[in-house]
């Protein structure tokens, strides 16, 4: 495929990435799948600057990001290293809280109303943010 040079319609460009902000809610897995079908991924936050950009666009609303620990350690959906990377958890989070009574703990990360991160039950229908890099090859065939 060809290299994407500009963002799709209704996506916002920022620092060589394109972002799409949902206005409805989905469970984390459904949000993850939505982004993948758009040749993108749930947002991966790699810096304080990117955190502030996303926070500005989503406002004080719980919003999924591309970070989960459903299979043990915390992992970013694009393979970015979690241990050495940017983090912005709320104090004493993540806590894998079981008190919700829905079974198991909390395995998916979201932006909270103040932008800091929390882990929550992945089935909760939160808004989400998709991200794709401008420099990556798109799946669309090149125009002749």
């Amino acid at each position: 495929g060809s290299e994407r040079t500009c963002c799709p319609v209704n996506w916002v460009e920022h620092e060589r990435s394109c972002y799409w902000f949902s206005r409805s809610g989905k469970a984390w897995a459904d949000a993850d799948n939505y982004c993948r079908l758009e040749d993108a991924h749930l947002v991966v936050v790699t810096s304080w600057e990117e955190q502030k950009f996303v926070q500005h666009h989503i406002g004080p609303v719980n919003t999924w990001m591309g970070l989960h620990d459903q299979n043990g350690p915390w992992k970013w959906v694009d393979g970015t290293d979690y241990e050495t990377g940017f983090k912005n958890w709320r104090p004493e989070q993540p806590d894998d809280w079981y008190g919700h009574g829905l079974g198991g703990g909390e395995d998916c990360a979201h932006f909270t109303d103040d932008g800091r991160w929390n882990d929550d039950v992945c089935q909760r229908p939160y808004r989400w943010v998709c991200e794709t890099e401008l420099d990556k090859a798109s799946q669309e065939p090149p125009l002749l």
Epitope: G72, E83, E92
Partner: antibody
Framework: QVQLQESGPGLVKPSETLSLTCTVS????????WSWIRQPAGKGLEWIGR???????NYNPSLKSRVTMSVDTSKNQFSLKLSSVTAADTAVYYC??????????????WGQGTLVTVSS | DIQMTQSPSSLSASVGDRVTITCRAS??????LNWYQQKPGKAPKLLIY???SLQSGVPSRFSGSGSGTDFTLTISSLQPEDFAPYYC?????????FGPGTKVDIK
């Protein structure tokens, strides 16, 4: 290969505090929850509690008032303190790693266990 | 707390036998159920997680089934090294309660 090793006194006097440490090798302590589980001789397994590196803890309600857990990431160790012990706390104490697949937690790596006897 | 019960508490069987152990939860725990084997003087070993998933390195003669409140561990053809106690454990609720165990011994 992840390995866990419990250490601490094998004999504790009644009313005193039991202190154990688990050293993790072959993997980072940062990536998982870590638990303590005990087993009195000839009996079943009892989960004591768990800890995560950011300080989050969960304790068995039946032991909560007496249990404290802590973690030292620089040494790749986590610890258990159980206060006001009685003979009923005599058991083999295991440390274990909490694994997870598809959101379901389980204990996939265990220490070999250390026997703690409470006696004067 | 969620209570876990196991039946039978012990059973006698011969090498080659098909053995079934049952675990019951006091409330629905979906598939948040794990099985362990414990040899004398050793730590428990994870056999099955999430009710039916075989842990890496565990022989395929071990299998698990069930969901909700009723679960089963099956050993399709008992081997000499399988004589040991077996424990179920729930991770639906914090407290991670274990069943009382089922001891499998030689007939």
């Amino acid at each position: 290969q992840v390995q866990l090793q419990e250490s601490g006194p094998g004999l504790v006097k009644p009313s005193e505090t039991l202190s154990l440490t688990c050293t993790v090798s072959g993997g980072s302590i940062s990536s998982h929850f870590w638990s303590w589980i005990r087993q009195p001789a000839g009996k079943g397994l009892e989960w004591i509690g768990r800890i995560y590196i950011r300080g989050s803890t969960n304790y068995n309600p039946s032991l909560k008032s007496r249990v404290t857990m802590s973690v030292d990431t620089s040494k790749n160790q986590f610890s258990l303190k159980l206060s006001s012990v009685t003979a009923a706390d005599t058991a083999v104490y295991y440390c274990a790693r909490e694994g997870k697949t598809g959101g379901v937690s389980y204990f996939d790596y265990w220490g070999q266990g250390t026997l703690v006897t409470v006696s004067s | 707390d969620i209570q876990m019960t196991q039946s039978p508490s012990s059973l006698s069987a011969s090498v080659g036998d098909r053995v079934t152990i049952t675990c019951r939860a006091s409330q629905s725990i979906s598939s948040y159920l794990n099985w362990y084997q414990q040899k004398p003087g050793k730590a428990p070993k994870l056999l099955i997680y999430a009710a039916s998933s075989l842990q890496s390195g565990v022989p395929s003669r071990f299998s698990g089934s069930g969901s909700g409140t009723d679960f089963t561990l099956t050993i399709s053809s008992l081997q000499p090294e399988d004589f040991a106690p077996y424990y179920c454990q729930q991770s639906y609720n914090i407290s991670f309660t274990f069943g009382p165990g089922t001891k499998v011994d030689i007939k």
